[in-house]
């Protein structure tokens, strides 16, 4: 099409743009390491960083771990996408009593309406079943017929929901006299260590949350308690701790009540790109410990790559590659220790501190 020629010409000589014949227009060329968010990007904002699998690009342009839905009571609602976390919700037959960022900190089974009550609104992943009296105008929970009134929207009797494991409290599903009062959980027998991640214990105004200890009279020294594998973030929200379940990660610090689990690359590897509380990309430590490894025939011409060897294996690497750079693999149990007097290199475990002294000790 001759009329397209001027548009194509405008792209020539401009290294930041290229001409896309399919859409017949100039497109912005994303810089190395960034990927287009659409077929023909027009500006730098149409390019994005690419995160590792199971990570997404958050609002601050950081690669952040997607939440996991691995708990038995959760299912995946939306998958982990390039710009949004995986979203988990309670599995069918349960509802969320304590929400968390992109997930649910505590799921309860939907209530079963007791005798004399029928389902007004079925339970969803977010809400419990709502029950109403079977015959309008008469509530089976009335103390006597003369005290009965039409239940208002906020006072529909509802069975006490049952929490799923790991919260092991039992619950009564029968309404008690008084119409709107719910049966109390038989939780008084249950105890909890002060910093245990379990959230059962003394009844709390907010399901799924409990104070660290019984609050002293007139004291505000109580805190929200999140479910296992969640922590209380700075904004006071229960947030999923990152997962270290990738093969190349190990746990550095555990998930605590007020801080996320942190992950690091397993021994013998190094973090090439970080992520919040974790490492988005681990690579084998690329420089071999000197004089401790052999040079196999098939690695003489290999360039450095970022592919990790299978777990439990670390191929030999070339301590003096032809290209002047280090190969990708290393022995995880070797570290560089320089003895300036003897010019020796001694193998030591990775976990041991590297002390460099003139005596080599």
């Amino acid at each position: 099409f001759p009329q397209d020629r001027p548009f194509e010409d405008t792209c020539h000589g401009n290294p930041s743009h290229y001409y896309d014949k399919a859409v017949r227009r100039c497109c912005y060329r994303c810089p190395m390491g960034l990927f287009p968010t659409q077929q023909c990007p027009q500006r730098p904002t149409d390019c994005r960083k690419q995160c590792e699998p199971d990570y997404y690009l958050d609002e601050a342009d950081r690669c952040t771990a997607c939440v996991t839905c691995s708990r038995d009571d959760l299912v995946e609602k939306t998958p982990c996408a390039w710009n949004s976390s995986r979203v988990c919700e309670c599995r069918p037959g349960m509802f969320c009593s304590t929400s968390a960022v992109n997930s649910c900190a505590r799921c309860f089974f939907h209530s079963v309406c007791p005798a004399g009550m029928i389902v007004k609104f079925p339970g969803t992943a977010q809400k419990n079943t709502v029950c109403e009296p079977a015959s309008p105008g008469v509530s089976p929970a009335c103390a006597s017929p003369e005290n009965c009134k039409e239940p208002s929207s906020g006072t529909i009797p509802q069975a006490k929901p049952t929490p799923v494991s790991p919260a092991t409290s039992s619950a009564s599903t029968m309404p008690v006299r008084g119409g709107t009062r719910l049966a109390q959980e038989a939780a008084s027998k249950l105890t909890r260590a002060p910093d245990s991640p379990s959230s059962v214990g003394r009844p709390s105004s907010d399901p799924g949350l409990s104070p660290t200890q019984p609050c002293p009279e007139g004291s505000g020294d109580c805190r929200k308690q999140c479910e296992p594998d969640y922590y209380l973030d700075e904004a006071g929200r229960c947030t999923a701790c990152v997962s270290c379940s990738r093969d190349d990660l190990v746990e550095k610090t555990p998930c605590a009540w007020n801080s996320s689990r942190t992950c690091e690359c397993r021994p013998g590897m190094i973090c090439a790109t970080s992520a919040t509380n974790s490492c988005a990309r681990c690579v084998p430590y690329p420089i071999c410990a000197a004089e401790t490894v052999t040079k196999p025939q098939d690695m003489a011409e290999k360039d450095t790559t970022f592919e990790a060897p299978p777990l439990g294996t670390q191929p030999d690497c070339n301590p003096t590659p032809e290209n002047g750079e280090a190969p990708a693999s290393t022995s995880p149990t070797q570290s560089l220790l320089v003895d300036s007097q003897a010019s020796k290199t001694l193998p030591i475990p990775t976990s041991a501190p590297v002390a460099l002294s003139s005596t080599g000790k």
Epitope: E264, C265, M269, G324, S340, L356
Partner: nanobody
């Protein structure tokens, strides 16, 4: 205690060059492996290059052929010569000691020194 001071950053046009330095103290003798990491605004901490105590080097793919890492053990100084700079090299650059041990987690930016800012822009 290990202390690192990075310097040499600045504003440079695409295609230009800079030489970063990292003055180290607290090491004995030749010191351990050393690394350069960088962190672009709002992004993660990224490995750039490593040099071993005996001078063997490693570079991440995006800087190969453009950056050169070196060290002067007598002066306890680490260097990063950056040529053919690109806008995507814009970041705060940090040096890190003994990356084999210290850089397994995503925390090798800003733990030892304040870093030096490199801005590549026309």
């Amino acid at each position: 205690e290990v202390q690192l001071v990075e310097s040499g950053g600045g504003l440079v046009q695409p295609g230009g060059s800079l030489r970063l330095s990292c003055a180290a103290s607290g090491f004995t003798d030749d010191g351990p492996d050393m690394a350069w990491y960088r962190q672009a605004p709002g992004k993660g901490c990224e490995l750039v290059s490593i040099i071993s105590a005996d001078g063997r080097t490693y570079y991440t793919d995006s800087v190969k052929g453009r950056f050169t890492i070196s060290r002067d053990n007598a002066k306890n100084t680490l260097y990063l010569q950056m040529n053919s700079l690109r806008p995507e090299d814009t970041a705060v650059y940090y040096c890190a000691p003994d990356p084999r041990r210290n850089c397994r987690g995503g925390d090798c930016c800003g733990n030892w020194g304040q870093g030096t800012t490199v801005t590549v822009s026309s």
